[in-house]
């Protein structure tokens, strides 16, 4: 039988589950561990003080419990502050606590103390320097200063002045007495150790403002824009550069050392990139303002004036044209234009237009067309209708006939055609 | 007929001036750079100054700057070259040229010269 | 400053034969950009010099075909296939790479 179904080995609530390996396991509620949830979670009371993590675990069938501490907190509950939080080791040194909970400091070669913050005297500690080399003592440690014929750390070695070579920058060194060398120097290079690049610059051939930066045997010209090259000899055609070197549409010319730029009207200025003022020579009358645009000015009028420059009365403020007509202003003389609207004509637009006078007759299928003021009627014949008398007057749509007699339009009329037994006009 | 023609040569003491005219005819000066070249007797040719076109931009080798000044007036088509502090060795004869085009800097037209002369 | 070096400084030809001048230049007259403008003219006696080639191997407009230019670099050549009566004077290379602009010394060409 399946494990769990045997009386649930489980005990405080715990759930048995069965693994696949078909034995049985519990799932323990909060606050119990142990196989059987036999055993009282140790951090369910929250041992663990600030934000120390509670992990707990059981060993020989005995529930315990570990804190996991927070930076700068200590001790089985992380209730003991850490001595080593405030970096109280000097030079590295490296920081533990000890059994007393201060701190300890291991410090490295060079120094001491309890923080590491003294220096070690290494010239009072023995003699370090060998060959009668002058002992000389640094922040954490020492060196040597040896006499003539010996070198290394600790003046352990006789010297040869080759060994290392100290010659600089690819300098060959040369042994020219017991203690004494020369340094060949490469081309570009000068002083004992061939440690000083030679400015090449003096004598520099950069023309056209160029700048001499000096190199290693050798010098570079730094050119102003105008000029390239290695000497700065070469001119520039700036009519080729990317982007254009003049502006707006205008027209480019190379010149020796610079460029000239033809600009289009309205612009100008060195690459064609200002707009002209035309406000600065516009002449708006008093009260318009003047608006800049390219090559050209725009006035905006005051009410009551109109005209390129605003100098013209605006005749559309006393109202000349009829109602819904549209008034303009003519900009050259100041006269008011009426754009008139449907069935009106004349200078004010207040003449009715007689549309049944003018050309063919509007009123389709013989209606009679009658004018009004502003618009015409069409007055229908027989069987027709719509505004224009052009929609034929379905008569069959009120359906007149009867006895399920079929019926046929006709141009003002019908027709009923009746079913065998029926007759009349209506089939009634 | 495309024609360049100098004038305003003459014979000058060492320390005098001299001013050199070139009139152009036959193209529309105002389009092209100009430039003056130099060729002392029995010698090759020297170039002494360039202008572009508007007159806005001018350059002179070492040996004639600071005492040579090159300059045009467009609406006269004419070229003009103001030759100060003159000395014995500019003696030459003086022919302005005109600039084809202003990327590869070549003359494709030459005046007939004007002979200068810098002498005691 | 650039200098130019022609070969020969003089010549003396018969008419029919080909002749050919070199001009040498102390630096490249390769622009920076890629081209190279070295140019010939042509001072027939008495007159201003006349303009022969230009960028190293473009004939000038009107300029005989027997006439042609080649070369890069610093090294530069100017040919005549046939030589013609016409054709006596002293020829100038030129450069305009660099400035100043400069001549070369100049070759006579005398006809034998």
């Known amino acids: 039988a399946p494990p769990c179904l045997d009386g649930s080995p489980c005990a405080n609530g715990g759930r048995c589950t069965q693994l696949p390996s078909r034995e049985a396991a519990c799932l323990c509620p909060p606050g119990w561990v142990g196989e059987r949830c036999q055993l009282e979670d140790p951090c369910h009371s929250g041992p663990c003080a600030g934000r120390g993590v509670c992990q707990s675990s059981v060993v020989a069938g005995t529930a315990r419990f570990s804190c996991r501490c927070p930076r700068g907190f200590r001790g089985p509950d992380c209730s003991l502050p850490d001595p080593c939080l405030s970096s109280p080791c000097a030079h590295g040194a490296r920081c533990s606590v000890g059994p007393d909970g201060r701190f300890l400091c291991s410090c490295p070669p060079g120094y001491q103390g309890r923080s590491c913050r003294s220096d070690v005297d290494e010239c009072r500690v023995g003699e370090p320097c060998r060959h009668g080399g002058t002992c000389l003592n640094t922040p954490g440690s020492f060196r040597c200063q040896c006499p003539a014929g010996y070198t290394g750390p600790l003046c352990e070695n006789p010297a040869v002045p080759c060994a290392p070579s100290p010659c600089r920058n690819g300098g060959t060194c040369r042994q020219s007495g017991d203690l004494t060398y020369d340094c060949a120097c490469l081309p570009g290079f000068e002083g004992q150790n061939c440690e000083v690049n030679v400015d090449d610059c003096p004598g520099h051939r950069c023309l056209n403002g160029g700048t001499c930066v000096d190199g290693v045997n050798t010098y570079n010209c730094q050119c102003p824009p105008e000029w390239t090259g290695q000497f700065c000899t070469e001119d520039v055609d700036e009519c080729q550069l990317q982007p254009n070197a003049c502006h707006n549409g205008g027209t480019c010319f190379n010149t020796l050392g610079g460029h000239s730029c033809v600009c289009v009207n309205g612009w100008t200025g060195e690459s064609c990139s200002q707009n002209i003022d035309d406000c600065a020579t516009a002449v708006c009358f008093h009260g318009a303002t003047c608006h800049d645009r390219v090559a050209s000015f725009y006035c905006a009028c005051p009410m009551g004036k109109t005209g390129l420059l605003c100098h013209l009365d605006d005749a559309c403020v006393s109202n000349p044209c009829h109602e819904d007509a549209i008034c303009d202003t003519n900009p050259v003389n100041g006269r008011a234009i009426c754009t008139c609207p449907p069935g009106f004509t004349g200078g004010a637009c207040d003449q009715d237009v007689d549309e049944c006078s003018i050309g063919a007759n509007p009123c389709e299928h013989l209606g009679r067309c009658v004018n009004t003021q502003g618009s015409f009627l069409c007055q229908c014949g027989r069987g027709y209708t719509g505004p224009r008398c052009e929609t034929d007057v379905n008569e069959c749509l009120s359906g007149p006939c009867r006895n399920q007699a079929t019926c046929l339009d006709r141009i003002g009329q019908f027709t009923c055609i009746c079913m065998a037994g029926f007759t009349g006009t209506y089939c009634e | 007929e495309v024609q360049l023609l100098e004038s305003g040569g003459g014979l000058v003491q060492p320390g005098g001036s001299l001013r050199l005219s070139c009139a152009a005819s036959?193209?529309?000066?105002?389009?092209?750079?100009m430039s003056w070249v130099r060729q002392a007797p029995g010698k090759g040719l020297e170039w002494v100054s360039y202008?572009?076109?508007?007159?806005?931009?001018?350059y002179y080798p070492d040996s004639v700057k600071g005492r040579f000044t090159i300059s045009r007036d467009n609406s006269k088509n004419t070229l003009y070259l103001q030759m100060n502090s003159l000395r014995a060795e500019d003696t030459a004869v003086y022919y302005c040229?005109?600039?084809?085009?202003?990327?590869?800097?070549?003359?494709?037209?030459w005046g007939q010269g004007t002979m200068v002369t810098v002498s005691s | 400053d650039v200098v130019m070096t022609q070969t020969p400084l003089s010549l003396s030809v018969t008419p029919g034969q080909p002749a050919s001048i070199s001009c040498r230049s102390s630096q490249s007259l390769v622009h920076t950009y890629g081209n190279t403008y070295l140019h010939w003219y042509l001072q027939k006696p008495g007159q201003s010099p006349q303009l022969l080639i230009y960028k190293v191997s473009n004939r000038f407009s009107g300029v005989p075909d027997r006439f042609s230019g080649s070369g890069s670099g610093t090294d530069f050549t100017l040919k005549i296939s046939r030589v013609e009566a016409e054709d006596v004077g002293v020829y100038f290379c030129s450069q305009s790479t660099h400035v100043p602009w400069t001549f070369g010394q100049g070759t006579k060409v005398e006809i034998k």
């Open positions: 202008i572009s076109r508007g007159g806005g931009s001018t």
């Open positions: 036959g193209f529309a000066f105002s389009h092209y750079d």
């Open positions: 040229g005109r600039h084809a085009t202003t990327a590869y800097w070549y003359f494709d037209v």
